[in-house]
């Protein structure tokens, strides 16, 4: 994963100043107090496409 200063983090990840790294938001379930989890909470969810018109 790239450093947050290099490029924006990819979808589903957020920048950790502490680690100088984009971190997977999925890890916030195990470590909810990590600094990057704030960015995960603020990020919009992945687009959801309805299965009917």
């Amino acid at each position: 994963e790239q450093a947050p200063g290099t490029a924006p983090c990819s979808r589903g990840s957020s920048a950790s100043a502490d680690l100088d790294k984009c971190m997977d938001c999925a890890s916030c379930r195990a470590r909810p107090h990590s600094d990057f989890c704030l960015g995960c909470a603020a990020a919009p969810p992945a687009p959801f496409r309805l299965l009917w018109p």
């Epitope: 994963e1 450093a3 100043a17 680690l19 890890s27 704030l38």
Partner: antibody
């Protein structure tokens, strides 16, 4: 029980390449969030962070030394390596490796350290 | 680089009294939610030992007489009451951005 141990050449001459090994146990460098840093301390002086390697092989270096540093790892053997090229007497120091790992509250600073290995650069 | 300046460089404190060590950063090491400052203790011939992480969180096994406070650029390590075994050099360290840097150290002597 987490432990780390550094090893190195002890003495080397100016312009040579310093190769250091950090052998650790009690944690895995394949665990998400885990990382190992190298830090050095000249005798009687302060601490200087050199480099860090992450579980996914991502690497970070101190910009003041970046051109001379290479950090790498062998996850299966629980080892982290640091090479410093073109050493000078100013590189004489005790070299430490230290772990940064995840916990419930986020990520530790350097919570476990090795005892250090003394390196002298002398002609 | 963020420069961490510790003061005093050394101090002598009587047994049972309070020791206060300051660490000032050249720029803020805090965000609205986090302060990325940590404290270590180092005794001669030993590696540093983590005491306090993220300004005020005591590392497991560290006595409650150690406490940390501060935000932004100004941080404090307090030891009260000081015990004989606290004689050591204390370092602050930040992880706000790279490179991670340490303060110059404060040597604590017990009178």
């Amino acid at each position: 029980q987490v432990s780390l141990k550094e090893s190195g050449p002890g003495i080397l001459q100016p312009s040579q390449t310093l190769s250091l090994t950090c052998s650790f146990s009690g944690f895995s460098l394949s665990t998400s969030g885990m990382g190992v840093s190298w830090i050095r301390q000249p005798s009687g002086k302060g601490l200087e962070w050199l480099a860090h390697i992450y579980w996914d092989d991502d690497k970070r270096y101190n910009p003041s030394l970046k051109s001379r540093l290479t950090i790498s790892k062998d996850t299966s053997r629980n080892q982290v390596f640091l090479k410093i090229t073109s050493v000078d007497t100013a590189d004489t120091a005790t070299y430490y490796c230290a772990r940064r790992g995840p916990d419930y509250y986020g990520y530790y600073p350097m919570d476990y350290w090795g005892q250090g290995t003394s390196v002298t650069v002398s002609s | 680089d963020i420069v961490l300046t510790q003061s005093p460089a050394s101090l002598a404190v009587s047994l049972g009294q309070r020791a206060t060590i300051s660490c000032r950063a050249s720029k803020s090491v805090s965000t609205s939610s986090y302060s990325y400052m940590h404290w270590y203790q180092q005794k001669p011939g030993q590696p540093p030992k983590l005491l306090i992480k993220y300004t005020s969180n005591l590392e497991s096994g560290v006595p409650a007489r150690f406490s940390g406070s501060g935000s932004g650029t100004d941080f404090i390590l307090n030891i009260h009451p000081v015990e004989e075994e606290d004689a050591a050099t204390y370092y602050c360290q930040h992880s706000r951005e790279l490179p991670w840097t340490f303060g110059g150290g404060t040597k604590l002597e017990i009178k």
